[in-house]
Amino acid sequence: VPRWRQQWSGPGTTKRFPETVLARCVKYTEIHPEMRHVDCQSVWDAFKGAFISKHPCNITEEDYQPLMKLGTQTVPCNKILLWSRIKDLAHQFTQVQRDMFTLEDTLLGYLADDLTWCGEFNTSKINYQSCPDWRKDCSNNPVSVFWKTVSRRFAEAACDVVHVMLNGSRSKIFDKNSTFGSVEVHNLQPEKVQTLEAWVIHGGREDSRDLCQDPTIKELESIISKRNIQFSCKNIYRPDKFLQCVKNPEDSSCTSEI
């Protein structure tokens, strides 16, 4: 008799999930020699332990603590780049500006980037058919709780000037419901963080508006100021030129506004 299986609204666990996590861990330690003390088998066991045999709507930050401990990593606290709805450009930037870090440049972020996973209550099986959707099913699912946990820790670690890249093409440039808006903003430590500098990335070629005046940016400024952190904002009118100038700052065309 086929066992009844909960059907969730979201996509199932990414295929080859265990192999991918393990391979990513090994790759990360190969290219980041300072993390070679990490035992990737233990990392996978801790990752698995956070969600296997647990109801996928009943996951807590506590479930991820063993993994958090194994993945403890020191990044320069004044070199943190947060992002919201513009991941690819943020990653292209840290790929060029090697001394800055997004969450996905850390071991735990690198392990889980773009993956989906969940288990089932009381069985050791991984559910490859479906996983809970944050909106339609539940917010305390394995993926959402993981990102909430690592994002909180990443924001808590930040100091001095923290940068955030925001997507100027979206209707809500700053979205209170994004991970940045709901987790990271509220976990920046005012005693350590002096300024949050937003970079608003323009999408259109001819878009010369000052998106730093957008109502949602003003809302972000208000939230940040209330937390005793200074706020500044820059328009990045030409993201392609911006990246090019990060690569080649001495280029003569890089003195003008980008």
Partner: antibody, heavy 123, light 112 residues
Framework: QMQLVQSGAEVKKTGSSVKVSCKAS????????MHWVRQAPGQALEWMGW????????DYAQKFQDRVTITADRSMSTAYMELSSLRSEDTAMYYC????????????????WGQGTLVTVSS | DIVMTQSPLSLPVTPGEPASISCQSS???????????LNWYLQKPGQSPQLLIY???TRAAGVPDRFSGSGSGTDFTLKISRVEAEDVGVYYC?????????FGQGTKLEIK
């Protein structure tokens, strides 16, 4: 079995570019970092850079930073190394290479190598 | 960058006799994980390099037990207990403790 097969020998003019390919088979291409190493005639081995084929992220030796571009085509399980502004000193054998994994740890040594691609730069 | 220095640069050996190659690094290659990131390769004439030893003393798959690696944080030795004709080629040490990985200048082993 695991194999890295590289493109054929190239003869290039000074100032031009060359693009060498390395086709991987016998393993999941995105699970391993791919490195590039070169060897000028009668000289020692020289590491040029790596690519993570899954993410496309790269890192290059300072010496080649401005002239080398390593890319990967996941659908073809192939890595590429392009070297621009060629000079006579770039005449060398170019290799792609990857580590082995020993019980979930990268061995730290290049256990698998392509057969090499000879690039000759002439004026 | 870490500098790797090999000696001798040329090593003529009689078959059946032992051989020893030295390698020095400008910094310790001992990682906090307890492993020493020193590798040895053999490049036979006309071939790609092949990994012989990794982590200073661990033989790679399929490497005969006549090859052994030893050393401390900065001084390393590759020993061949009894040289065979097929062992001719250039031997390279390499550090992989940090980027960029760097190689020694090579030791050419030839049969007397």
């Amino acid at each position: 079995q695991m194999q890295l097969v590289q493109s054929g020998a190239e003869v290039k003019k000074t100032g031009s570019s060359v693009k060498v390919s390395c086709k991987a088979s016998g393993y999941t291409f995105t699970d391993y970092i791919m490195h590039w190493v070169r060897q000028a005639p009668g000289q020692a081995l020289e590491w040029m850079g790596w690519i993570d084929p899954e993410y496309g992220s790269t890192d290059y030796a300072q010496k080649f930073q401005d002239r080398v571009t390593i890319t990967a085509d996941r659908s073809m399980s192939t890595a590429y190394m392009e070297l621009s502004s060629l000079r006579s000193e770039d005449t060398a054998m170019y290799y792609c290479a990857r580590v082995a994994i020993i019980t979930t740890v990268a061995s730290g040594g290049f256990a698998y190598w392509g057969q090499g691609t000879l690039v000759t730069v002439s004026s | 960058d870490i500098v790797m220095t090999q000696s001798p640069l040329s090593l003529p050996v009689t078959p059946g006799e032992p051989a020893s190659i030295s390698c020095q690094s400008s910094e310790s290659l001992l990682h906090s994980n307890g492993k020493t990131y020193l590798n040895w390769y053999l490049q036979k004439p006309g071939q790609s390099p092949q990994l012989l030893i990794y982590w200073m003393s661990t033989r790679a798959a399929g490497v005969p037990d006549r090859f052994s690696g030893s050393g401390s944080g900065t001084d390393f030795t590759l020993k061949i207990s009894r040289v065979e004709a097929e062992d001719v080629g250039v031997y390279y040490c390499q550090q992989f403790l940090e980027y960029p990985p760097t190689f020694g200048q090579g030791t050419k082993l030839e049969i007397k």
